[in-house]
């Protein structure tokens, strides 16, 4: 029962995490204009992985895609790649883990096969989560570097007469969504790996030991106990736990994408 719960929970947590990674990747607010000096601004800039946007005080928002591939910074390309790899691995992991779920019967699939699939999906979730965390962290590091560089050059003087204020960017909502989502996917993957250990049939075969009593002899076979636990290779007496099964509506939680106005 504990294994089913761990596996089911791992799947749900990973599902939420991957949904979050997808949402973060699509979001436009990876970096937002720093409003430290001017909390109310007439023009507000924010940028995503795929496009940059400008929201005017008038309420109009204009977004422009990055239509060049070669002209983009290598770091941005790397972040895009990490996020996409994370999504692809996570999606494959979800597909694999659905078939690996203990509460779902698919033909006469062996427990060993389910254990292997659970481990595979777990590893995929871990790598997916790490990709997302790495991608977001690389972008955050890029922002911090640029922030301090633009702070140093905040005011560039035209003979001391004209001030040109440089736009500084700070962490956007997508970074936090990405970090949390990556963390959840990672946790989900670890839970799947833990569940795999419980699913895997024990390989050790104990030899029957005879105990001679005074009147008659009785042979005690540990194999019988093994079957009753539900972890053994004897599947005849095995109980199928479907208490852990949940509807999709209960477990899916897709963070909605907002263009904060």
């Amino acid at each position: 029962m504990a294994v089913t719960a761990c596996q089911g929970l791992g799947f749900v947590v990973s599902l939420i995490g991957i949904a979050g990674i997808i949402a973060a990747t699509c979001m436009d607010q990876w970096s937002t204009q720093d409003l430290y000096n001017n909390p109310v601004t007439a023009v507000f800039n924010y940028q995503g992985l795929w496009r940059s946007c400008v929201r005017e005080s008038s309420g109009f928002t204009e977004c422009r895609g990055y239509f060049t591939l070669l002209g983009l910074p290598a770091m941005l390309q790397a972040v895009r790649a990490l996020m996409i790899v994370g999504i692809v691995l996570g999606a494959i992991g979800l597909l694999v883990s659905i078939f690996a779920l203990k509460c779902i019967r698919i033909g006469s699939m062996e427990d060993s096969a389910k254990a292997n699939m659970t481990l595979t999906s777990g590893i995929m979730f871990i790598v997916s989560g790490l990709c997302a965390i790495a991608g977001v962290s690389v972008f955050a590091n890029m922002l911090v570097t640029n922030f301090w560089m633009s702070t140093a050059n905040m005011y560039t003087g035209m003979g001391g007469m004209v001030q040109t204020v440089q736009t500084r960017y700070t962490f956007g909502a997508a970074l936090f969504v990405g970090w949390v989502a990556g963390g959840l996917t990672l946790i989900g993957g670890v839970m799947m790996c833990i569940a795999c250990r419980g699913l895997a049939p024990e390989e050790t075969n104990y030899k029957a030991v005879s105990y001679h009593a005074s009147g008659h002899s009785v042979a005690y076979k540990p194999g019988g106990f093994k079957a009753s636990t539900g972890f053994g290779s004897n599947t005849k007496n095995k109980k199928i736990y479907d208490g852990g099964a949940r509807t999709e509506d209960e477990v899916q939680s897709y963070p909605s994408k907002h263009d904060y106005v």
Partner: antibody
Framework: EFQLQQSGPELEKPGASVRISCKTS????????MNWVKQSNGESLEWIGN????????SYNQKFKGKATLTVDKSSSTAYMQLKSLTSEDSAVYYC???????????WGQGTTLTVSS | DIVMTQSPSSLTVTAGEKVTMSCKSS????????????LTWYQQKPGQPPKLLIY???TRKSGVPDRFTGSGSGTDFTLTLSSVQAEDLAVYYC?????????FGAGTKLELK
């Protein structure tokens, strides 16, 4: 046809308060921010502040904070500006103006003349 | 606050003449996010409210005659009237739409000789 119809001229005593209205028609009132501008005796223009009719959020020119209060009534598509503690300095023509692309004011009311005199 | 300086304060012209007026801002009005200059030009005739001519420094509002042209970037802007007509006699204001508080220039008065 877009229209911003402002209330008539006002004559007030110093220390009093006044509320100027700006009734809109011909467009979605909540879709555009409403701005208020002051023009003293035919001179230059001064931005007072603006209000987002949808959320009710306001931005004020620091100079007019405490002097002007901007409100809206969505049901009647009307924007209001209240001016308090009036002095002769407040005597001017006040305009309401709709905010458009580039934060420009594309449609203006005809103006309300406020005269503060004892 | 961004200070808008217009010059000259008044211009005396003859019909059909080409006219240029200047507007300078104390800070750049160029937004790095969309590379647009948040500067607007208005025309105000006596007893009337201002009328929008040009926004984003060079985008003409629909219905505005093409003899009105806005140009410039950063801190220096120009409004050009290619051929002045009698109905163009008015006061022209530039406005900073980039940073709060939104500020206006003192205006350039266009008069007929």
């Amino acid at each position: 046809e877009f229209q911003l119809q402002q209330s008539g001229p006002e004559l007030e005593k110093p220390g009093a308060s006044v509320r100027i209205s700006c009734k809109t028609s011909g467009y979605s009132f909540t879709g555009y921010n409403m701005n208020w501008v002051k023009q003293s005796n035919g001179e230059s223009l001064e931005w007072i502040g603006n209000i987002d009719p949808y959320y009710g959020g306001t931005s004020y020119n620091q100079k007019f904070k405490g002097k002007a209060t901007l409100t809206v009534d969505k049901s009647s598509s009307t924007a209001y500006m209240q001016l308090k503690s009036l002095t002769s300095e407040d005597s001017a023509v006040y305009y309401c103006a709709r905010m458009y692309h580039g934060n420009a004011f594309d449609y203006w009311g005809q103006g309300t003349t406020l005269t503060v005199s004892s | 606050d961004i200070v808008m300086t217009q010059s000259p304060s008044s211009l005396t012209v003859t019909a059909g003449e080409k006219v240029t007026m200047s507007c300078k801002s104390s800070q750049s009005l160029l937004n790095s996010g969309n590379l647009k200059n948040y500067l607007t030009w208005y025309q105000q005739k006596p007893g009337q409210p201002p009328k929008l001519l040009i926004y984003w420094a060079s985008t003409r509002k629909s219905g505005v005659p093409d003899r009105f042209t806005g140009s410039g970037s950063g801190t220096d802007f120009t409004l050009t009237l290619s051929s002045v007509q009698a109905e163009d006699l008015a006061v022209y204001y530039c406005q900073n739409d980039y940073s709060y508080p939104l500020t206006f220039g003192a205006g350039t008065k266009l008069e007929l000789k």
